[in-house]
Structure formats: structure tokens, C-alpha cells
């Protein structure tokens, strides 16, 4: 007998994970056999849709690989022409492990601004989002909050906020971690220690000290009266994001020195400045120990002999050291006009380097004497005859003043580079001239009173200003 369709197993709510299989069963009793159709959210599911499988005369609907978009109300309708059609409906709840759809990215932010690290998630049940900084869970506070979207918002970013972050999305089905990202906090350049102004005597050495910090670590440049510093030595060290710059100056004129700290934030720069004035005091009597001061040679007579920018020792036992020492050399050079072409350049080198000795700047400036070996080379090789004549004249009192005695060093009272090669200054001119010694005739028949050592090669005999001693 014909029988109207009856759904004996109504549809139930089905939970399914993404990419898994989900099946709805719609068991129908009727005669004749009914036609069964399926809808999702009231839209007919086509029999030839390859995402579905419909079996058992339409009573089983299988979704072969569930997608999150398959969520919805599924209904089966049975009709065999006897009586009315019958329908049963059930929901498909697509369950989904957490998935981070918009992960955080590396961020560079300037201190004091607001930073937002995104972390958008998917999942069913809806995942909860938390954040890890370094190896520890991040605690929220008045500045730091996790937004509804999962993003991390940090107000008024501080240096200590810098570090490695990752977000964690969690639901009952599992946990997802983002990749680790870096929050870099950049800090405008700031000067921690400004250079101090000084009132100094002419020829002093002054060290200006400037310390700055910032992220990235700033660079420090020095400006002298509005221009880049042209002379002086700069020493820099960096420790714990602090740059320390020391500008050592040899003071020959007053000036305004500015320390400029600069760092870069993307395409923009931040700078901080601090200035100090150097003024020159009236010349005062030097300390007991201080026999003179250091200055760059500014005379004329020894220009060709002394190294360029040579620091020389000016002896304050003279009222005007520069003028007095220049006069000494000038007077002595006049005597040299009559000496042989072999002797003259050697003697000039010796005189200039003896009267304008190389200078060791420091707390107490000290002159560096000529090496004994070079003095003897002039005395007993280059100028043997002339030296004998000069000594004879001296003994016979033929010189009008003692000036010439001061001009000529007593070789035996000079340090030897054999005992300490750093104790004395070398004469590069003699290193050059000794190459030509082979061609010179012997200059004295008598054996030199001291064996003349081999002078060092010119490569190792650049002028040596001995460096700083500091009592601090």
C-alpha cells in the first residue's frame, strides 16, 4: 500500500574539523521510494557537486573535505507523491584549530609613540590570544593591552619594551604560535655630558669630552667655529649604547666647539648639540716642572727640515720662545753657508731638530732629544772637518756669544736609540743622505771616536712625537 514519507532519523547538529569528513543521515520510510533533496542555508545542493557525496538513495550526505565556509543549516526533503513532502534540518558547526591569519611583523618605533603589533586569528571556538615577550608571558598594564582583534597595543613605548614578541592563539582544539618578531625602540639622540668651556694658555692641550646616547647609537661630529674640526685628534668609544667622544686640541686660537650627536630613524635624523668655548688666557708663569709648552712650528728657517705639522717644544726660559729659538737657528744657519754641500743638509737637520725638539704633549710637556747616533753621524761622518773647526773656534773664544754653543748638541749627553729606540727622535734627512755616503770621500783621516751604528732605514724613521702622559 502507498505510504507517505516519514523521516525516522531526524538530522542532528554535526561538529566537524576543517579538512575532515562530515556526514548527515536522513533515514526515510515510505512507499514508493521517495526522492530526497538536500539544501544548505535553503540553497539546493546539486547532485553533481564534487565536494559532496550523496548515497543510500539520497539518505546520506557526506561533505568530503569540510571548509570553514561549509558552516550552516543543512535540510533534507523527502517526497514520493503520497501525502506531503517532509523535511528535517540540522546544523553543521565547522570546528577549527586556531589559525593566525595576520601575523605580527617587525616594528621599529620611536620612544614615546604608540606601537601596534597585529595578530588576527581564525578558529572555532574563537581562539583567545595572548602574547609572549622573550620567554615569558606578557602581562597587560595601563600601557600594554591585547585588543579584541588579538593585536597588541603599547602606548608611550619605552626602551624596555624592545625585544622579541610572538602571539599565541588558543582554543579547545589546539594552539597556534606566530613567528617571533622584533620590536625595536628607537630613541632620539641625546647628549649626556656636554663639553666644558676652558680658559687656557696658548700652546696648551685641551681635551673636550662629549657623551651621547640614543638608539641607534648616535655618531658624534665636532664643529669648530661653524666648520668641521680640521685639527686635533678624536678618540671614540661605545659602551652600552653610550658614545663617548674626546677631542684633543692644541690651542693656538680661541674658538667655539660644538659637539653634534646624530642618529637616523628611517629617512629622518635626530640631532642634539652642545657647545663649549675655548678662550686663551694671558700667558702666566709656568709651573715649576713645566719648562715649556708644545706648539706647531710656525717659523721659516726650519720649514723644509721639520715634518709638516710638527709639534715642537718651546722653551719658556726665553721671554719669547718662538722668536728666540728661531733666531738661534737663523744665526747658526748663517755660519753654515760656508760649509761643504755634504755637511750642510745634515747640519741643518741636526740644528733644527735640536733647537726645535720634538714635543711630547701631556700634563708636563717634555722635549724629545735627538738620538745620539744621529748626532754622531753629523759630527763624525757628514761634518767631521767643520765640527773640528767649530770646536776649535769655541775653545779660542772666537764666537761673539754663547748662542752657537746652544745650537750644537753635545752628542754624549743624548740618549742612544740602541738602549731605548723610543727615547729619542731620528733625523729622516740623514737616513736619506746616508744612501749617498758610498759616493762621498772620507771626511776625516782620524777614526771616529765612537763607532757609528747603521742608521735605521727611512721606513722606520718618521718623526716621532711621543704621546701623552696623563696623571689622572
Amino acid at each position: 500500500l502507498p505510504k507517505a514519507p516519514v523521516i525516522t532519523t531526524p538530522l542532528e547538529t554535526v561538529d566537524a574539523l576543517v579538512e575532515e569528513v562530515a556526514t548527515f543521515m536522513c533515514a526515510v520510510e515510505s512507499y514508493p521510494q521517495p526522492e530526497i533533496s538536500w539544501t544548505r542555508n535553503k540553497i539546493l545542493i546539486k547532485l553533481f557537486d564534487t565536494r559532496y557525496s550523496i548515497r543510500e538513495n539520497g539518505q546520506l550526505l557526506t561533505i568530503l573535505s569540510v571548509e570553514d565556509s561549509d558552516d550552516g543549516i543543512y535540510c533534507c526533503t523527502a517526497n514520493n507523491g503520497v501525502g506531503g513532502a517532509v523535511e528535517s534540518c540540522g546544523a553543521l558547526q565547522v570546528k577549527m584549530k586556531p589559525k593566525i591569519t595576520r601575523p605580527p611583523i617587525n616594528v621599529k618605533i620611536i620612544e614615546g609613540l604608540k606601537a601596534v603589533l597585529p595578530c588576527t586569528t581564525m578558529g572555532n571556538p574563537k581562539p583567545s590570544v595572548s602574547w609572549i615577550k622573550g620567554d615569558s608571558p606578557l602581562r597587560e598594564n595601563s600601557r600594554i593591552a591585547v585588543l579584541e582583534s588579538g593585536s597588541l597595543r603599547i602606548h608611550n613605548v619605552q626602551k624596555e619594551d624592545a625585544g622579541q614578541y610572538r602571539c599565541v592563539a588558543k582554543n579547545s582544539l589546539g594552539t597556534a604560535y606566530s613567528k617571533v618578531v622584533k620590536l625595536e625602540v628607537e630613541v632620539f639622540a641625546r647628549i649626556l655630558r656636554a663639553p666644558e668651556s676652558h680658559n687656557v694658555t696658548f700652546g696648551s692641550f685641551v681635551t673636550l669630552h662629549c657623551t651621547a646616547t640614543g638608539i641607534p647609537v648616535p655618531t658624534i661630529t665636532w664643529i669648530e667655529n661653524g666648520n668641521a674640526v680640521s685639527s686635533g685628534s678624536i678618540q671614540e668609544s661605545v659602551k652600552d649604547r653610550v658614545i663617548d667622544s674626546r677631542l684633543q686640541l692644541f690651542i693656538t686660537k680661541p674658538g667655539l666647539y660644538t659637539c653634534i650627536a646624530t642618529n637616523k630613524h628611517g629617512e629622518k635624523f635626530s640631532t642634539a648639540k652642545a657647545a663649549a668655548t675655548i678662550s686663551i688666557a694671558e700667558w702666566s708663569k709656568p709651573q715649576k716642572d713645566n719648562k715649556g709648552y708644545c706648539a706647531q712650528y710656525r717659523g721659516e728657517v726650519c720649514n723644509a727640515v721639520l715634518a709638516k705639522d710638527a709639534l715642537v717644544f718651546l722653551n719658556t726660559s726665553y721671554a719669547d720662545p718662538e722668536e728666540a729659538q728661531e733666531l738661534l737657528v737663523h744665526t747658526a744657519w748663517n755660519e753654515l753657508k760656508v760649509v761643504s754641500p755634504v755637511c750642510r743638509p745634515a747640519a741643518e737637520a741636526l740644528l733644527c731638530n735640536h733647537i726645535f725638539q720634538e714635543c711630547s704633549p701631556g700634563v708636563v710637556p717634555t722635549p724629545i732629544p735627538i738620538c745620539r747616533e744621529y748626532c754622531l753621524a753629523v759630527k763624525e761622518l757628514f761634518c767631521a772637518k767643520e765640527w773640528l773647526v767649530m770646536e776649535e773656534k769655541t775653545h779660542r773664544g772666537l764666537y761673539r756669544s754663547e748662542m752657537h754653543l746652544l745650537s750644537v748638541p753635545e752628542c754624549s749627553k743624548l740618549p742612544s736609540m740602541h738602549w731605548d729606540p723610543t727615547a729619542c727622535a731620528r733625523l729622516p734627512h740623514l737616513d736619506y743622505n746616508k744612501e749617498n755616503l758610498k759616493t762621498f770621500p772620507p771626511m776625516t783621516s782620524s777614526k771616529p771616536s765612537v763607532d757609528i751604528p747603521n742608521l735605521p732605514s727611512s721606513s722606520s724613521s718618521s718623526f716621532s712625537v711621543s704621546p701623552t702622559y696623563s696623571m689622572t
Partner: antibody
């Protein structure tokens, strides 16, 4: 040939004093800078002090105020006066010739500070 | 004060090998007016006083074998022993003579296989 011979070392109690001497020969002593350098047992070298040809002295921070360097150019002798000694001052003390490089070294004299 | 850091702390080499020791200074030890670096190298054999090998960073002290050489400027310096010999087993120190207080590196021990 340069010779530097140190003497004056020995065993002293903490807080005590010692005077080290270094007799120089073979060179014109008065023309050169002289230094003291020490080496604790099994440790590295530590520069202590230098004295220039005008008897101006400079010191390492670790000994400033406790040690005094001096020289007698007539006797060709360098001195180091050690006061308020501490156990960490235990070391071999070398007398060294040199201005900016330490060129010639003595054999050293041992100072032991212990109670 | 200027801090000198040597690397490595120790090295083991076979006779004839090349040994390189580095010394890094916390500040420049080079003077602007003459471009000289005031950096020295010393050798100390077991039970002996140290001896100067190299001064002004690259100038060999008299009597030192040619296999010892120094290089570098400003803050980075190197001592090279070309073709190391058994008698080179020692501790090597760098030292700055640029600014008092003068300072040494911590030393590098060279041992031979």
C-alpha cells in the same frame, strides 16, 4: 751591555712597607725614562709607574698614593717605595728601561705580602 | 685607562706553522701628528723576564728574528710569527705606550705540538 739589578724584595705583613732598588749599568742612566712593572704569580704583566729624566712620575691607579718612584742619577739607581702593602701586591717586581716601549728588563725581585 | 684585549687566549701550533695574535685597543693609540701607533709586543718565556719584540706597532727590535712581525694601526693590531720554532713557546703580551697609565693585554700563550 745594559744591566738592571733589582733588590729589596722580601716577605712583609699587610699594611707594611718595603723599598725596592734597581741599580743600572752599561748606559747613561740619567738620559732615560725608567719604569716598574710587576707580575703576580701565574698572572699577566701590570705596569706600575714611570719616571722621566726630570724625575716627574706617573702611576697606575692601583698603586697611586701607596707607591712612590724616584731616581738617583749619581748612584745610577731607581727606587720604588711600597707603603700600606696588601696581599694582592704579592708579585715579582721588574725594573724596566724605556720611554714608550719597555725595552730592557731586569730579572725582578720577589715581594710577598702575607700575615 | 686604555684597555687592551688579546685574542686568542692560547694557541697550539706545529713547528713551521704561522701563528697570528690579535690585540684590540679600547681607544686609538695612534698620534695624529706623526701617524705612529704606540703599541708594543713582548715575549715572555717560562721562568724568564719579558723581552721587547716590536715597538711602534711594526718596528722590529734589534736582535729579534725576522719571523716576528707586527702590523695594524689606530685600534687593531697583529703580531705574526712566521714559521714558528720550538723556542717561540711563550706568553706574548701587547702593551700601549700612548697614554699613562700604560697597560698590557692579558697575554696569549703559544704552545708547540
Amino acid at each position: 751591555e745594559v744591566q738592571l739589578v733589582e733588590s729589596g724584595g722580601g716577605l712583609v705583613q699587610p699594611g707594611g712597607s718595603l723599598s725596592l732598588s734597581c741599580v743600572a749599568s752599561g748606559f747613561t742612566f740619567s738620559l732615560y725614562y725608567m719604569n716598574w712593572v710587576r707580575q703576580a704569580p701565574g698572572k699577566g704583566l701590570e705596569w706600575l709607574s714611570v719616571i722621566d729624566t726630570h724625575s716627574i712620575a706617573y702611576y697606575a691607579d692601583s698603586v697611586k698614593g701607596r707607591f712612590t718612584i724616584s731616581r738617583d742619577n749619581v748612584k745610577n739607581t731607581l727606587y720604588l717605595q711600597l707603603n700600606n702593602l696588601k696581599p694582592e701586591d704579592t708579585a715579582l717586581y721588574y725594573c724596566v728601561l724605556g720611554r714608550t716601549a719597555l725595552v730592557r728588563w731586569g730579572q725582578g725581585t720577589q715581594v710577598t705580602v702575607s700575615s | 685607562e686604555i684597555v687592551l684585549t688579546q685574542s686568542p687566549n692560547s694557541v697550539t701550533a706545529s713547528v713551521g706553522e704561522k701563528v697570528t695574535i690579535n690585540c684590540k685597543s679600547s681607544q686609538r693609540v695612534q698620534l695624529g701628528s706623526n701617524q705612529k701607533s704606540y703599541l708594543n709586543w713582548y715575549q715572555q718565556r717560562p721562568g724568564q723576564s719579558p723581552r721587547l719584540l716590536i715597538y711602534y706597532a711594526s718596528t722590529q727590535q734589534s736582535g729579534i728574528p725576522d719571523r716576528f712581525s707586527g702590523s695594524g694601526s689606530a685600534t687593531d693590531f697583529t703580531l705574526t710569527i712566521n714559521s714558528v720554532q720550538p723556542e717561540d713557546a711563550a706568553v706574548y703580551y701587547c702593551q700601549q705606550g700612548y697614554s699613562a697609565p700604560f697597560t698590557f693585554g692579558q697575554g696569549t700563550k703559544v704552545e708547540l705540538k
